[in-house]
């Protein structure tokens, strides 16, 4: 079964939260600023799939949605490589590929995406550690990592493989439209900042919708502005979720897929960074590198081009997410 998150409709802020119209105008610059800052931020997606033909075989796909050139990809399980995770494969665009059991075949699918086939038989069965992480080292963005999980057991009765989502078609109008809005937004932001240059900034009220993250309050004062923020999200569509990625689903039910497009964690990343990163419940957006945790009800709209990554018609469900404007 597939779970879909709906694109949120932006609602006006609640009067109780924001008060007068004047306050609302002050929210806009922050939203626009965040959009301007995060528009070019790279993302990593991870997708885990059980092969219907071989129930003990799993395919992990990872991709990097950024403008930089990839210098190294590391796939690990049981957590990030530097935090107790075990490396399954390392791929270098020029120096080659190395993999470790139970990895069977690692390969580049495109210049910015890789796939790894795992053998599920034996003591080192994939479900012994269900979290898979992909780390992309790129220039100039640095190091970006995302994790996804896979189900603990398979039901042989489910013979039909899960249907992957269709590849998104980013038409030129959409790309130009988003770019135009962002450009206009940034110009408008500069105009607003210039206008309010000499006024003292009023204190924003804390958001009721983001109790988990006090740091987010200055940035995300309303439900509407949170939904508008282009920040990463986590969606794990599996019935086997490790403690670190315990994300709820709107529709429930088991799925053999796990897709996780996310900004994930920027270097430096060690055990502490991994352990202390809260993964909030359903449809939450998580951005570790800029210290922003803005929680909203559903996914942000699709915004990006970079959609030719998977010529394969079975392309990743991870492509469903917000890809940003490059």
């Amino acid at each position: 079964m597939r779970t879909e998150a709906q694109v949120p409709a932006l609602q006006p802020p609640e009067p109780g939260l924001e008060g007068a119209m004047g306050h609302r105008t002050l929210v806009l610059p922050w939203v626009l600023l965040t959009l301007c800052v995060t528009a070019g931020t790279p993302e990593v997606w991870v997708q885990v799939r059980m092969e219907a033909t071989e129930l003990s075989s799993f395919t992990i796909r990872c991709g990097f949605l950024g403008s930089g050139s990839i210098s190294l990809v590391t796939v690990s399980w049981g957590g990030p490589n530097g935090a107790g995770g075990t490396t399954l494969a390392v791929l270098h665009p020029e120096r080659g590929i190395r993999q470790w059991a139970p990895a069977r075949q690692a390969r580049w699918e495109t210049q910015s995406s890789i796939s790894l086939i795992l053998e599920g038989s034996g003591a080192s069965s994939p479900c012994a550690n269900t979290t898979f992480c992909c780390k992309f080292a790129s220039f100039p963005e640095g190091s970006w990592e995302a994790c996804g999980s896979l189900p603990p057991s398979s039901d042989p009765g489910l013979s039909a493989p899960p249907t992957p989502a269709p590849i998104l078609r980013a038409d030129l109008a959409g790309i130009l439209g988003v770019s135009g809005v962002l450009l206009f937004g940034c110009v408008y932001l500069l105009h607003l900042l210039r206008r309010h240059k000499h006024r003292p900034a009023p204190r924003l009220q804390p958001s009721r919708t983001s109790p988990q993250a006090p740091r987010a309050r200055a940035w995300a004062p309303s439900q509407a502005s949170q939904a508008a923020l282009h920040v990463p999200y986590a969606t794990i569509n599996t019935s086997c979720r490790p403690a670190t990625l315990d994300t709820a689903h709107p529709h429930g039910g088991p799925s053999w897929w796990a897709s996780l497009p996310t900004h994930a964690a920027h270097r430096p990343q060690g055990p502490a960074a991994w352990a202390s990163t809260p993964i909030p419940a359903r449809g939450s957006f998580v951005s570790v590198e800029n210290g922003l945790y803005a929680q909203a009800g559903e996914r942000p709209p699709h915004t990006g081009p970079g959609l030719t990554l998977f010529p394969d018609p079975r392309g990743p469900r991870a492509m469903e997410g917000p890809l940003g404007v490059r």
Epitope: T87, R95, G96, Q99, R107, A137
Partner: antibody, heavy 114, light 106 residues
């Protein structure tokens, strides 16, 4: 320029232990695993094992489990291989090699003789 | 353990020849195969990785092919400096090398 500089030749007695070093320069050691390979005189190459610089985790060829120990000193970008309970069968040239086996040390010749 | 077999221990060749060195894996290794060249008194050098990808700086007369269990390294226009030992290696499950093939002049 990437270089893997290994320690010099060793002549040891049977039953003893030896520790061979491999110092990496020109790239960040912590980015890559380090492999160790044995080449007996006039023979093929045998993979001994590798070490993950991030967490010190090791993988071994079953044949060398109990014979070789791999360690790493991140501060000096040096990996070490200790071979114990040496016999004449252990006489060989030992190479360290980068993760992708595209950079190799010059080799360390180990002679086990009484 | 996966065994890599290079059936030809020695191969006689002349300059300008087309030479094919073969390697067989005991089980399916996909394309997780590399080829190395080793000259006397030197460390091995990586030539080919992922069965068919030529490593940086390797002359284009060296090509690799194959997948699954059968792999071939071809030198299209043999040069005197290519006289060396050639080893295949699988890295699908840990790493194992073939026994090597020595190229000699006829």
């Amino acid at each position: 320029e990437v270089q893997l500089q290994q320690s010099g030749p060793e002549l040891v007695k049977p039953g003893a232990s030896v520790k061979i070093s491999c110092k990496a320069s020109g790239y960040t050691l912590t980015d890559y695993y380090m492999n160790w390979v044995k080449q007996s005189h006039g023979k093929s190459l045998e993979w001994i094992g590798d070490i993950n610089p991030n967490n010190g985790g090791t993988n071994f060829n079953q044949k060398f489990k109990g014979k070789a120990t791999l360690t790493i000193d991140k501060s000096s970008s040096t990996t070490y291989m200790e071979l114990r309970s040496l016999t004449s069968e252990d006489s060989a040239v030992y190479y360290c090699a980068s993760l992708f086996f595209d950079y190799w040390g010059q080799g360390t010749t180990l002679t086990v003789s009484s | 353990d996966i065994v890599m077999t290079q059936s030809q221990k020695f191969m006689s060749t002349t300059v300008g020849d087309r030479v094919s060195i073969t390697c067989k894996a005991s089980q399916n290794v996909g394309t997780a195969v590399a080829w190395y060249q080793q000259k006397p008194g030197q460390s091995p050098k990586l030539l080919i990785y992922s069965a068919s990808n030529r490593y940086t700086g390797v002359p284009d007369r060296f090509t690799g092919s194959g997948s699954g269990t059968d792999f071939t390294l071809t030198i299209s226009n043999m040069q005197s400096e290519d006289l060396a030992d050639y080893f295949c290696q699988q890295y699908s499950s840990y790493r194992t090398f073939g026994g090597g093939t020595k190229l000699e002049i006829k």
